[in-house]
Interface confidence: low
Amino acid sequence: AIVFIKQPSSQDALQGRRALLRCEVEAPGLVHVYWLLDGAPVQDTERRFTQGSSLSFAAVDRLQDSGTFQCVARDDVTGEEARSANASFNIKWIEAGPVVLKHPASEAEIQPQTQVTLRCHIDGHPRPTYQWFRDGTPLSDGQSNNTVSSKERNLTLRPAGPEHSGLYSCCAHNAFGQACSSQNFTLSIADESFARVVLAPQDVIVARNEEAMFHCQFSAQPPPNLQWLFEDETPITNRSRPPHLRRATVFANGSLLLTQVRPRNAGVYRCIGQGQRGPPVILEATLHLAEIEDMPLFEPRVFTAGSEERVTCLPPKGLPEPSVWWEHAGVRLPTHGRVYQKGHELVLASIAESDAGVYTCHAANLAGQRRQDVNITVATVPTWLKKPQDSQLEEGKPGYLHCLTQATPKPTVVWYRNQMLISEDSRFEVFKNGTLRINNVEVYDGTWYRCVSSTPAGSIEAQARVQVLEKLKFTPPPQPQQCMEFDKEATVPCSATGREKPTIKWERADGSSLPEWVTDNAGTLHFARVTRDDAGNYTCIASNGPQGQIRAHVQLTVAVFITFKVEPERTTVYQGHTALLQCEAQGDPKPLIQWKGKDRILDPTKLGPRMHIFQNGSLVIHDVAPEDSGRYTCIAGNSCNIKHTEAPLYVVDKPVPEESEGPGSPPPYKMIQT
C-alpha cells in the first residue's frame, strides 16, 4: 500500500516570497508523484516546480496559486493510486492603486457645499487599514467636517468647501506590508470670492515706437481688484506711472496699452487679481522688442552646367523669427520650377550658363529687413590658348613650358613629370597663367611633361617631351688640390661629358710637355713612380666641336705619407702619479700631432695645469685620477693625409704593502713608476 509519510498542509504565504508544500511517500514498489491544483495536473515552471516529491514555489502568486493543491502518488505497475490531503495557501498581499472620485460622477459636478466621496484603490489580504492625507498631512476622523472610516477605503467630505481643496492621497497597511496610492487626486473647489482668470495676457513682440496691448481680466464675487506691475514691482496706474512708462494706459476692463514702445519698456509685466478671499492670482506676460541681426556673408559659389545645386540661407537671429525669401534680378523666386526656393534654400535644378549672376537672400520681421548677396558662377570646361610643345632646353639655364587656357572660373593648372605631380620647389615654378618654369635645367629633366587645366566643369590636358641639351662639363670636376705619395705609383683621373663625347688631354700649366714616365691615357694622368719634380700645376682640357673647350686646373703635391715612429702603449698608473703617453710621427710635410681623450679633442690651450703636450707629440698627465681612465688617441695629420693610433690608460689604487712582502717586492702588474 502507498503511504503518505509527509502530507501537504494549508499555510500562510506572502505574495512574491518562497513557499513549499511537502509531500513524502512510502510504497513497496516504484511510484511516481505529481501534483493537482483544483483537480488539474500542475506543470513545472521556473516559478513553481516539483522538488523530489514536494512542490516548491520560488515566488508565490496570489492569482496563479489560489485553489486546492493535492499530491498524487501512483504505482504504474499495479495501477494503485493514493491522494494526499488537500492544502491551500492563505496568501497575504497588498497592491497599490489610484485615488478616484466616487461621488459625484465627474469633477465637473463638484460644487461648493456638495458631498464629495473619494475611494482609495489599494487592495490586499487581509483587508488593509487605510489612512488619508491632504497635501501630505494625515486626516483623522471628524477633522474639519470630514467623515473618515479607518476600516473603509472611502473618504467622505460633507459638505465640501474651498478649504477642502488640495492633493488627496492614501496609504494602507496589513500583515503583508504597506502601500500608498499610485495616483493622487487633486480636489479643487472654487470659492466665488477667490479671483479667477477670465482672460490672461499674452507675450507680445512689437517694433520700436509701435504700440503694445496686454489684456487681463479676473472674475470674483464681489468683483476683484486688478493691478499691473512692471519688472521692478513698480505699479502702473493711470494716476501714477513710472518714469519709463509715461505712455502707459490702464483701461477699465483691465487691458494695458503701451504706446511708442522703447527698449527700456521691454520686460515682464505682471497682472495681479485679488479677490475678497484667497491668494492673489499673478499672471505674467513679456513684452519683447522686435530685433533682427545682420546676415552672415556668402562665399561665392561655382557650379557646373547640368547639375543640381542648393544654396542655404541661414536666417539672421531675430525676434520674431525672420521670414526668408530669395530674389534674382529683383524678382522673388517661385516655390517651384527649374530655379526655385525650397524652405531657406535656393535650388538650381539642371543649371544653365544663363543662371550665373547675383542672387539675394532677404530676411525680414517686425524689426526690419536684411539682405545678403551670393555670386553664382557657372563653370565652363577650359579651352586651349597655347598647348605645351616638345622642347629642347639647355642644361644649367631656365626652361619654360607653356599651358595657356581660358574658362570660367579661371582654371587651375597642375603639371606632371613622368606621371608624378610637380610640387613647387626651388627648381620648379608654375606661373598664374599656367606656364611651368624649370629654374636650372638638369640632364634628368629630359622626360615627358603633362599639364592639366581644370574647372569644376571639367578638365583638358596635353603633354610635351623635353630634350635637354647637355653642356660641356667635367664629370666630376677634378679636385683642385691633390696629393701623391713620393716614390709610389699615382693616377689623376679627368672625365667630361657634352652634347658630343669630348676629347680629354692633360698638360702642365706652364705649357711644358709631360715627362716620359708620365702618361696621359684617355684623360687619366699616370705617374709610374712619383718624384719630387712631379709636383706642380697641371691642366685638364676637355673639348668637342660644337661646344669648344673647358679647362680644369689641378695643383699636385708630392708628399711622404705619415708613419708613426713611436705609438702610445697600454698604460696603468697609480692614482696620484704621472702618466706619460708617447707619440711621434714622421712624414712630409711634417705632421702635426693632436690628442683625443674620452671622445673629445684635447685643446693644448685649454688643458689646465695637470696635462701637457710636448713638442715631440707626447702627452703627460700629472696627478692622475680615476676619471682620467679611458682610451687616448694620437692623431697625426698634414695637408696630404691623416693617421691615428690609440691606447688605453688605466688608473688604479696603490695597494697597501703586506708584512710578508719585502720593501723591494714588485707591484702585481706592469706600472709606470714616477
Epitope: S307, E308, E309, R310, V311, T312, L314, P315, K317, E321, G343, H344, E345, P456
Partner: antibody, heavy 119, light 108 residues
Framework: QVQLQESGPGLVKPSGTLSLTCAVS?????????WSWVRQPPGKGLEWIGE???????NYNPSLKSRVTISVDKSKNQFSLKLSSMTAADTAVYYC????????????WGQGTLVTVSS | EIVVTQSPATLSLSPGERATLSCRAS???????LAWYQQKPGQAPRLLIY???SRATGIPDRFSGSGSGTDFTLIITRLEPEDFVVYYC?????????FGQGTKVEIK
C-alpha cells in the same frame, strides 16, 4: 537606395594614425550631398568629426581639426578619414554618413566599424 | 559650440503609453535646424525627424516633433515594443553640428 560601407583596421596603436574608407553604392559621390564621418565611444553619445564635398571642400569639428584629414576619390566613389596621434580616448565606433541635400542632418548611415586604440 | 542637453537620461514607460523626450540647446537654434534620431543596439542611428517637426521617409505618424528657440520635444504617442531604444537630438544650425547625450526609453 544609397548604401555606405566603412572599412579599415579595427586596432590602432597609441600615437598611430587611423585610416578608414567609406564606399558609396547605389548613388554617386558627386551628387549634391556632403559626406560625413561621425563617431560614438562605447556607451556614449555621437560626435561629428567632419565632412567633405565631391569637389574636395572640407569642414572639420574644431575639437579634432588639427588631427583630421578627409579626402574623396570620385573614380572609386568613396571617401576616406585619417585621424592622427590616436589615444585611448579615440576608441569608438566610426560611422560614415550622408547629409540630406544642403542640410546638415544625416539621412543615410554606414553600419559602423569599431576601432580600438591599444598597444 | 552649442551644447545640447537631453532629459531625462532614462525614461521608464509601458507599451501603449505616451513618451515625451526633451532636448535643450545652450543657444537659440532656428526651428528649421533640429533633428531626432533613433538608435537600436548594435546599429547605426536612423533619422526620425528633421526641421524640428518633419517626419523622415517611412517614419510612423506616432512620432512627432515640436519646439523652438532652445527647447524642443519628441513625442511618441503610443509606445510599441520596438520603440524601447535610445533617441538622440542634433542641432545643425551652427557649426560644428552637435548631438545630445541621448535618452534611453526602457520598459517599466
Amino acid at each position: 537606395q544609397v548604401q555606405l560601407q566603412e572599412s579599415g583596421p579595427g586596432l590602432v596603436k597609441p600615437s598611430g594614425t587611423l585610416s578608414l574608407t567609406c564606399a558609396v553604392s547605389g548613388g554617386s559621390i558627386s551628387s549634391i550631398n556632403w559626406w560625413s564621418w561621425v563617431r560614438q565611444p562605447p556607451g556614449k553619445g555621437l560626435e561629428w568629426i567632419g565632412e567633405i564635398y565631391h569637389s574636395g571642400s572640407t569642414n572639420y569639428n574644431p575639437s579634432l581639426k588639427s588631427r583630421v584629414t578627409i579626402s574623396v576619390d570620385k573614380s572609386k566613389n568613396q571617401f576616406s578619414l585619417k585621424l592622427s596621434s590616436m589615444t585611448a580616448a579615440d576608441t569608438a565606433v566610426y560611422y560614415c554618413a550622408r547629409d540630406e541635400s544642403g542640410y546638415d542632418y544625416f539621412d543615410y548611415w554606414g553600419q559602423g566599424t569599431l576601432v580600438t586604440v591599444s598597444s | 559650440e552649442i551644447v545640447v542637453t537631453q532629459s531625462p537620461a532614462t525614461l521608464s514607460l509601458s507599451p501603449g503609453e505616451r513618451a515625451t523626450l526633451s532636448c535643450r540647446a545652450s543657444q537659440s537654434v532656428s526651428s528649421s535646424y533640429l533633428a531626432w534620431y533613433q538608435q537600436k543596439p548594435g546599429q547605426a542611428p536612423r533619422l526620425l525627424i528633421y526641421g524640428t517637426s518633419s517626419r523622415a521617409t517611412g517614419i510612423p505618424d506616432r512620432f512627432s516633433g515640436s519646439g523652438s528657440g532652445t527647447d524642443f520635444t519628441l513625442i511618441i504617442t503610443r509606445l510599441e515594443p520596438e520603440d524601447f531604444v535610445v533617441y538622440y537630438c542634433q542641432q545643425y544650425g551652427t557649426s560644428p553640428r552637435t548631438f545630445g547625450q541621448g535618452t534611453k526609453v526602457e520598459i517599466k
